[in-house]
Every structure is written in structure tokens, then in C-alpha cells.
Amino acid sequence: ESGYAQNGDLEDAELDDYSFSCYSQLEVNGSQHSLTCAFEDPDVNTTNLEFEICGALVEVKCLSFRKLQEIYFIETKKFLLIGKSNICVKVGGKSLTCKKIDLTTIVKPEAPFDLSVIYREGANDFVVTFNTSHLQKKYVKVLMHDVAYRQEKDENKWMHVNLSSTKLTLLQRNLQPEAMYEIKVRSIPDHYFKGFWSEWSPSYYFRTPEINNSPGEMDP
């Protein structure tokens, strides 16, 4: 699927002061979709500022966002999911800045969950499994997952594996023996829909066993 630019590329706003970004989540609550927007600058005074979406909606011309602290939020079934919507920051009914956005290009999946790692002694490997709510969804069903793992003592030395299934095998020989590992996973849309990485799943921690020497073999 060709998609031009990076996943989740967003238009620069007309007024830098009010530049914002948004992400959509489809079927996030039953058949309801959501759209979340926030200002890029956390110091923007959001008093009296409103968000509105118009176009590519079912049965209505426009919808207003609800404000939850510093984010703006809509939950609705009324997204047409084809065509571009115009999302505007407004004050007193006057638009300050707007962006044309196709909601199918700013999809942020829900975070994977139930991550676990099981060691198979006979196979000398670790089977990593996790779950995703998207297996039950009707729109964003196909995801690419990013499994990241590291030795706990290596602060920033994450290893990454991309996969489309929810099961991964890590060979024991590729891991350090008698070490504590941290592992986590996130997801991104991978068929037609485009957008952003999900939040990371909660981390899972596992320890690798010591090297089992064969009889007669000496430790180095």
C-alpha cells in the first residue's frame, strides 16, 4: 500500500501558536470511534479554545470536541472514514487554524496486552506471546508489532523485532545466560490504515537460565 510520507505526518498549522496533532482510534468502544487532539505546545492557554471537525461525517455537518484537561476528544459512530475532514481550533466561533485530515491516516492502535515469555528447556528457546484487541475489530485488524527487549542492566540497548503475528521465538543462544531481561511490545496499522505506534504494553521481566554444560565439559 503506497502512502507517500511517514506514518502520521501532519500538516503544519497556519498559526504556530496553535499547532496541534490528532490521532484516531477505530472501534475503541464497541462500534464507537474516537478522535483525540492536543496542542503541540503544552503552554498554550486553552481557555475558551474549542475544537471542531467538519466534513466526512455521517448525518451531520460538524461535531464539537469535549475538553478533558489539556486534550480534546470525540467519541462517535459518525465518522464516514472516507474523505478528508477539516479539524479547526476555534475561539468564539472564529477559526484560528485548521487542518484537512483523513482519519484513516492517523490511526493509533490500542496497546497490546497479556505479554508473557515461556522458556522451553528442550528447545532452548523462549516463546513470547501477547494479545491485541484488534484481532476482534472489523476495521484495523492487520497490525505490525514491534517487540523490544533488553538486558535490564543495558539502559538503552534495546533489540527490536518486527512481526505481524502475536507469537515470537527467541533463541537462548542469542541471549546472555543468567541475566534479567525486560520485554515490551507496541503496534502500528499495517493494511490500508496508517498512523502512529500504540503505547507500549506493560513490560514483562524474565530471567535466562545458566548455561547447561554437557557431562565432561569443563567451564572455561
Partner: antibody, heavy 118, light 111 residues
């Protein structure tokens, strides 16, 4: 009103290149992707590729990869389609079209006739 | 590539009568209720004109005698009451997968 105005007809020899322009007006240029679709005489429509004017990112039909280049000039709200190594089968009307959504075409240019003949 | 098969190739209909054009795709162009099928009208010497997007959404300014339906691999464009100005070639197009392909066209004439 929203308009796409294309450059004039071209006659080219086999092996040459042609560069067709498409000037957009009546809307914010960076809001919509622009695509190129061609139509050989008496034939149907064939999508060639498109460009995102905001980023310059392109998507090409594999059939034309290596022969087609799409570029844009945001200062003049113009996109360009260059097709190289022309052959007689490239004789067609070339249309630029705005993508109202992924990926259908809600506004079309008037078309540019490119004739490839020795 | 997704192959688009339009039928019939040509169609002659009396003024005021219904015209129906079909488009079948070699694989599904739907994701649940999102149908990535679009219809265009092209008159001689003119560029195509968008009529219907997303299988059933009427483009702004298009008369409501035009309608679209279908899902999966089978789609239909209907002109409920043919007018003289509807004489044209009609094309379907899918946008679920690159390259975005068009049907071969259906020529509609007055009987």
C-alpha cells in the same frame, strides 16, 4: 473555484522525455494529494502515481517505476510529471487529478495530449 | 493488481428509464463498512467526473438520479431515470490497493 490547469500538448520522439505541469488554484495546495492518470486513444483510465504536495512524498504505479518522476513547487502550487524513455504506447491524454480522499479523484485537469511518434 | 470487470460494455436505454452498470473486482475492496469503490462519468473530449465515492456517497453537485451500492467484490451504479445529458462512458475504480485500477468502462447511449 477549485481548478487544475495543465500545460499544453506535446509531440515527442521515441526515447525522449516529456514533462507535464498541473497548476492548482482555489484551495490550499498542501491539503490534497495530486495524482496522474492517463488515457490512451479509445482506451480506459490508468493510474500512474501521485504526490503529496505537503511532503513531496510520492507513490508510483510499479508499471512506471524508473520512468516516471513526480515533483511539486509549493511556491507556484504546481505539480509536475516527467515520463522518460518514451515509446509509441505512451501516446495518451495525461490528466492530473486531486485526491479528495484515499484515493478517489474529485477534481481533474483538462488533460494534456502527449504524442510519441518518430 | 486488482482486476476490475465492468458489465455490460455498452448499454442502450430509453429516456426516463433505469440504467444499471455493474463492476466486479478480483478481490474484495471492502474493509467492513468501508467500501473503496468509486464511479466516474466521462463525456467525449472531457476529463472524467466523480459521481460516487465510497460505493454509495453522492459527490456534491451530482444529481440524485445517480446512486451506487454494493460491497466486497460486487458493485452497481444506477441511473434511476436516464436523461439525454447522461450519455457518456462510466468507469469504476478501486482504491484499497496500489495500483489503483479502473474498470474498462461502460458506454451508455439513448435507445
Amino acid at each position: 473555484q477549485v481548478q487544475l490547469v495543465q500545460s499544453g500538448a506535446e509531440v515527442k520522439k521515441p526515447g525522449a522525455s516529456v514533462k507535464v505541469s498541473c497548476k492548482a488554484s482555489g484551495y490550499r495546495f498542501t491539503d490534497y494529494e495530486l495524482h496522474w492518470v492517463r488515457q490512451a486513444p479509445g482506451q480506459g483510465l490508468e493510474w500512474m502515481g501521485g504526490i503529496d504536495p505537503k511532503t513531496g512524498g510520492t507513490a508510483y504505479n510499479q508499471k512506471f517505476k524508473g520512468r516516471v518522476t513526480m515533483t511539486r513547487d509549493t511556491s507556484t502550487s504546481t505539480v509536475y510529471m516527467e515520463l522518460s524513455s518514451l515509446r509509441s504506447e505512451d501516446t495518451a491524454v495525461y490528466y492530473c487529478a486531486r485526491s479528495g480522499g484515499r484515493w478517489y479523484f474529485d477534481v481533474w485537469g483538462q488533460g494534456t495530449t502527449v504524442t510519441v511518434s518518430s | 493488481d486488482i482486476v476490475m470487470t465492468q458489465s455490460p460494455d455498452s448499454l442502450a436505454v430509453s429516456l426516463g428509464e433505469r440504467a444499471t452498470i455493474n463492476c466486479r473486482t478480483s478481490e474484495s475492496v471492502s474493509i467492513h463498512l468501508l467500501h473503496l469503490m468509486h464511479w466516474y462519468q466521462q463525456k467525449p473530449g472531457q476529463p472524467p467526473k466523480l459521481l460516487i465515492y465510497g460505493a454509495s456517497n453522492l459527490e456534491s453537485g451530482v444529481p440524485d438520479r445517480f446512486s451506487g451500492s454494493g460491497s466486497g467484490t460486487d458493485f452497481t451504479l444506477t441511473i434511476s431515470s436516464l436523461q439525454a445529458e447522461d450519455v457518456a462512458v462510466y468507469y469504476c475504480q478501486q482504491s484499497i490497493k496500489d495500483p489503483y485500477t479502473f474498470g474498462g468502462g461502460t458506454k451508455v447511449e439513448i435507445k
